[in-house]
């Protein structure tokens, strides 16, 4: 788009005539105050379009914005619209007239606003005053727009002097109405209730002075209306709450409850929903599974956790071998039940520095007047393996025996291995396994005993070596779920003296 003359500001004489031309690659049109003006449109042979606006007998009232835009253009890009501002200094016109709605400026947030008092002459000095005050306010003035700034709720007037005459504008009224984008939060005293109990929901909005609440709920659909109560909370400004209270809930009251909040100034709205469940009677339900056999490691701390859902809140008890457990004063046992959400609970039994005696049969029982649930498991205390003894002997039969004894829980596995080249073993040569009829012609005999009092297994294994012709490093390794231990012994042939 090309405007001739280009502007962006022109000062024209009263009573004069002036011609403005706009041209572009499609049909163009001159507009003022969103209205098309009488103009002459033409199309040139090179397919350019133009429009000529002739302003005749100009007066101060012709002062203002003029736009050239492509005809029928929708969703204009900035370069599809050109602006020109024309001043026609006219001593007979003081301030340009305003529409009635321009005199009432409603603010809905802290924002810079413009008091649109405009004059016809850009050379005039214009000042802003409170309606009843003489002091000029220090607010910047733009002759094309007016005074822009942040204003208090007040009445304002603009003043200018034309010749020797002081001229006042109409009064402008600024009213700050507290409105913001709506952000609703909905919560319920309980989202699960038993029939006969009350349902109470709260819908809260902060930051708006005037809002309208509307509730949708299952009862409403069947024509049974409940009157919500609106409350203006004083703990902070513009804090409004709507309370929906349904006494003596029925099963049919289960469902979605929606709070819709609107404010009419900016047409903002928001809604949030919450689900309410009305149950016939209370319940307790286990969530997830806890294996029938649980493990703890000796001298370590172990927390056993049970997760369940319940309504109403239950009583939780723990038992060991049918005896009720409580927090021990010595701090060896800690019991806690946490409410992790409205109806979900986590109950924990913590054994601090586990002892062998704490193995046994544990039960957690959760109950209230309507229901109960219990969960039991056996606790096994795992003890890391220890090799207690590794000895070598030379019976008269000519064979050589190595005996390995160890303990642990669960039952240890035993692995025998040997290495021939003492210098290179075990770094360079992997040890070879013994005991399953290897080339060493070894034999293995293993006995396992369970010691009830210590609650652990003892393993005794004897390795018989038929003929040893050079020194041999023999290793006994014990392994179970919680660890491993090993010892080594060097077995020398009968013919060699032991050094």
């Amino acid at each position: 788009l090309v405007i001739t003359p280009p502007g962006p500001e022109l000062i024209l004489n009263v009573s004069s005539t002036f011609v403005l031309t706009c041209s572009g690659s499609a049909p163009v049109v001159w507009e003022r105050m969103s209205q098309e003006l009488p103009q002459e449109m033409a199309k040139a042979q090179d397919n350019t379009f133009s429009s000529v606006l002739t302003l005749t007998n100009l007066t101060g009232l012709d002062t203002g914005e003029y736009f050239c835009t492509y005809n029928d253009s929708r969703g204009l890009e900035p370069d599809e619209r050109k602006r020109l501002y024309i001043f026609v200094p006219d001593p007979t016109v003081g301030f340009l007239p305003n529409d009635a709605e321009e005199l009432f400026i409603f603010l809905t947030e802290i924002t810079e606003i413009t008091i649109p008092c405009r004059v016809t002459d850009p050379q005039l000095v214009v000042t802003l005053h409170e309606k009843k005050g003489d002091i000029a306010l220090p607010v910047p003035y733009d002759h094309q727009r007016g005074f822009s700034g942040i204003f208090e709720d007040r009445s304002y007037i603009c003043k200018t002097t034309i010749g020797d005459r002081e001229v006042d504008s109409d009064a402008y009224y600024v009213y700050r109405l507290q409105v913001s984008s709506i952000n609703v939060s909905v919560n319920a005293v309980q989202t699960v209730v038993r029939q006969g109990e009350n349902i109470t929901l709260m819908c809260i909005v902060i930051g708006n002075e005037v809002v309208n609440f509307e509730w949708m709920y299952p009862r409403k659909e069947s024509g049974r209306l409940v009157e919500p109560v609106t409350d203006f909370l004083l703990d902070m400004p513009y804090h409004i709450r709507s309370i929906l209270h349904i006494p003596s809930a029925e099963l049919e009251d289960s469902g979605t409850y929606t709070c819709n909040v609107t404010e009419s100034v900016n047409d903002h709205q928001d809604e949030k929903a919450i689900n309410i469940t009305v149950v016939e009677s209370g319940y307790v339900r286990l969530l997830g599974e806890v294996g029938a056999l649980q493990f703890a490691e000796l001298h370590r701390s172990r927390t056993l956790q049970v997760v369940f859902e319940a309504y109403p809140p239950p009583t939780v008890l723990w038992f060991k071998d049918n005896r009720t457990l409580g927090d021990s004063s010595a701090g060896e046992i800690a019991l806690s039940t946490r409410n992790v959400s409205e109806t979900r609970y986590v109950s924990e039994l913590t054994l601090v520095r586990v002892k062998v005696a704490e193995a046994g049969h544990y039960t957690m029982r959760a109950f209230h007047e309507d229901a109960e649930v219990q969960l039991s498991f056996q606790l096994q205390i795992n003890v890391p393996v220890r090799v207690l003894e590794l000895s070598e002997s030379h019976p008269d039969s000519g064979e050589q025996t190595v005996r390995c004894r160890g303990r642990g829980m669960p039952q240890p596995n035993i692995i025998w291995s040997a290495c021939r080249d003492l210098k290179r073993c075990p770094r360079e040569l992997p040890p070879m396994l013994l005991g399953n009829s290897s080339e060493e012609e070894s034999q293995l005999e293993t006995n396992v005993t369970y010691w009830e009092e210590e609650q652990e297994f003892e393993v005794v294994s004897t390795l018989r070596l038929q003929h040893v012709d050079r020194p041999l490093s023999v290793r006994c390794t014990l392994r179970n779920a919680v660890g491993q231990d090993m010892q080594e012994v060097i077995v020398v042939p009968h013919s060699l003296p032991f050094k």
Epitope: D231, F232, L234, D235
Partner: antibody, heavy 118, light 113 residues
Amino acid sequence: QVQLVESGGGFVQPGGSLRLSCAASGFTFTNYAMSWVRQAPGKGLEWVSAISGVGGSTYYADSVKGRFTISRDTSKNMLYLQMNSLRAEDTAVYYCAKAPHWGPFGSWGQGTLVTVSS
Amino acid sequence: DIQLTQSPDSLAVSLGERATINCKSSQSVLYRSNNKKFLVWYQQKPGQPPKPLIYWASTRESGVPDRFSGSGSGTDFTLTINSLQAEDVAVYYCQQYYSTPYTFGQGTKVEIK
């Protein structure tokens, strides 16, 4: 014409109870938050308690929390302050005041004197 | 809680002179999204309840003479009485109504010098 008239003040021993009333007229009672404000002899103003308009949420100064209860009867346009476990430092003129929500106390009653002494 | 501190505690001013009372808030009572300051000034004469003069920190109550004016930021406020008159002798209080517990300044006594 807005009118607030307090009553129920008087002489009471420490530990005793008293119930103050405030009769409101000339405005829509539930459209406004109502407060009690007190003034000890020769001292400044101290806000005591408030109740919000329609919903009736209640608020208290720490100095009276747990001892005083604000309430109202919307059918009678009455505001109340139940004062229990009274102490000598509760001696004051008690005013009832009305305010638009989130606004200043625009109207005040003339006050009622409460004296707590043995 | 928001504390309000007034200064001075008392003030003696000649008739026709200006009286200035300050009120300092321990935290802002300005609601930023609409620039409203939740502070009111009251005048109290002996044996009478307080009377509101200026609310929103700077808006005069109707019927209050224009020699009374209020100004201030979010935490520092001023009540100015231009050209003090004999009937202005009273105790003046500021009060915040931003949030409960509502709080008052300790009061400033204005007398004629």
